[in-house]
């Protein structure tokens, strides 16, 4: 008789999830000498232990602590780039500006980027059919709790000037319900962080509005100011030119506003 299996609203665990996590870990530790000491099989065991055999709506940050401990990594605290709803450009930027780091440039972020996973209560099985959706099912699911945990730690580590890339094409440029708005903003440490600088990325070529005056940006400024952190904002009118100028700062066209 086939065992009854919970049907969730979200997509199931990414195909070959364990193999993908292990392979990414090996690749990352080969590329980053400071993480060569990491034992990828133990990392996978800790990752597995956070969600296997547990109800996928009952996951806690505590479940991920063994993994957090194994993945402890020091990044320059003044070189952190946060992002919201504009991941691809943020990653393209740190690929060029190699001394700046998004969460996905760290081991734990790199392991889990774009993956989905969940288990089932009281079985050692990974659920490849469906996983809980944050809105429709539950917020304390393995993926959401993982990103909440690593995002909080990443924000807590930041110092000096912290940059955040925001998507100017969205109706809410700053969204209080995003990971940035609900986790990272509230975990920046005022005693370490002097300024949060927002880069608002424009979508349309002819868009010359000052999106730093957008009501949601003003809301972000208010939240940040109340936390005794300074706020500044820049429009990035031409993201393609912006990346080009990061690559070739000597280019004569890079002296004008981008």
């Amino acid at each position: 008789v086939p065992r009854w299996r919970q049907q969730w609203s979200g997509p199931g665990t990414t195909k070959r999830f364990p193999e993908t996590v292990l392979a990414r870990c090996v690749k990352y530790t080969e590329i980053h000498p400071e993480m060569r000491h990491v034992d990828c099989q133990s990392v996978w065991d800790a990752f597995k232990g956070a969600f296997i055999s547990k109800h996928p709506c009952n996951i806690t940050e505590e479940d991920y602590q063994p993994l957090m401990k194994l993945g402890t990594q020091t990044v320059p605290c003044n070189k952190i780039l946060l992002w919201s709803r504009i991941k691809d450009l943020a990653h393209q930027f740190t690929q060029v500006q190699r001394d700046m780091f998004t969460l996905e440039d760290t081991l734990l972020g790199y392991l889990a980027d774009d993956l989905t996973w969940c288990g089932e209560f009281n079985t050692s099985k990974i659920n490849y059919q469906s996983c809980p959706d944050w809105r429709k099912d539950c917020s304390n699911n393995p993926v959401s709790v993982f990103w909440k945990t690593v995002s909080r730690r990443f924000a807590e580590a930041a110092c000096d000037v912290v940059h955040v890339m925001l998507n100017g094409s969205r109706s809410k440029i700053f969204d209080k319900n995003s990971t940035f708005g609900s986790v990272e903003v509230h975990n920046l440490q005022p005693e370490k962080v002097q300024t949060l600088e927002a880069w608002v990325i424009h979508g349309g070529r002819e868009d010359s509005r000052d999106l730093c005056q957008d009501p949601t940006i003003k809301e972000l400024e208010s939240i940040i100011s109340k936390r005794n952190i300074q706020f500044s904002c820049k429009n990035i009118y031409r993201p393609d030119k912006f990346l080009q100028c990061v690559k070739n700062p000597e280019d004569s066209s890079c002296t004008s506003e981008i």
Epitope: F17, P18, V26, C40, Q41, D45, K48
Partner: antibody, heavy 120, light 107 residues
């Protein structure tokens, strides 16, 4: 039908090395991990280490670190265990055993065992 | 390392008896526990995985239970071919560790 066939018995002098092989057939070699477990005469089972062939990574129990090297050759579907600086306490039957990469299950298949005798 | 402690270390029983072997982990291992049967001069054979799931081809008289730190292997009605040594093993973390074994002998 999955089979793990190990190399034959060995008699070694203290201080020397031994290399035991484990050839897998009847399954996808790269989809699994291979562990080495030993059993001294009249004693229990002791896990030595594990290799994941498709990643080329291995780890071993701290007790054996620096003495054991676990490798795999994907082209011949063979896992190897090399134990150096042998002493009399290493006299044991050495088993290879297969598990899934995610290790969400047990060792489902075992080799027949290889007796290694260390004696001067 | 996680220590696995089995009890008893040996027991005598008759054909048809109900036999229970326990295994305790020194820290929580969820349900990442396997049971193996080993006969003299033979390789171990997997009986139970995930604490309570029966390996295919294993008779239903074998069952496993437990989660966290305390686990049990039960043979509901001992058969002549069941006289052997039984080992528990955790696969929650490295290094993988086994219990010291329980020898089931004929009374």
């Amino acid at each position: 039908q999955v089979q793990l066939v190990q190399s034959g018995a060995e008699v070694k002098k203290p201080g020397s090395s031994v290399k035991v092989s484990c050839k897998a057939s009847g399954g996808t070699f790269s989809s699994y991990a291979f562990s080495w477990v030993r059993q001294a005469p009249g004693q229990g089972l002791e896990w030595m280490g594990r290799v994941i062939p498709f990643l080329g990574i291995a780890n071993s129990a701290q007790k054996f670190q620096g003495r054991v090297t676990i490798t795999a050759d994907k082209s011949t579907s063979t896992a190897y265990m090399d134990l150096s600086s042998l002493r009399s306490e290493d006299t044991a039957v050495y088993y290879c055993a297969r598990d899934d990469i995610a290790a969400l299950g047990p060792f489902d298949y075992w080799g027949q065992g290889t007796l290694v005798t260390v004696s001067s | 390392d996680i220590q696995m402690t089995q009890s008893p270390s040996s027991l005598s029983a008759s054909v048809g008896d109900r036999v229970t072997i326990t295994c305790r982990a020194s820290q929580g291992i969820s349900s990442h526990l396997a049971w193996y049967q080993q006969k003299p001069e033979k390789a171990p054979k997997s009986l139970i995985y995930a604490a309570s799931s029966l390996q295919s081809g294993v008779p239903s008289r074998f069952s496993g239970s437990g989660s966290g730190t305390d686990f049990t292997l039960t043979i509901s009605s001992l058969q002549p071919e069941d006289f052997a040594t039984y080992y528990c093993q955790q696969y929650n973390s490295y290094p993988r560790t086994f219990g010291q074994g329980t020898k089931v002998e004929i009374k």
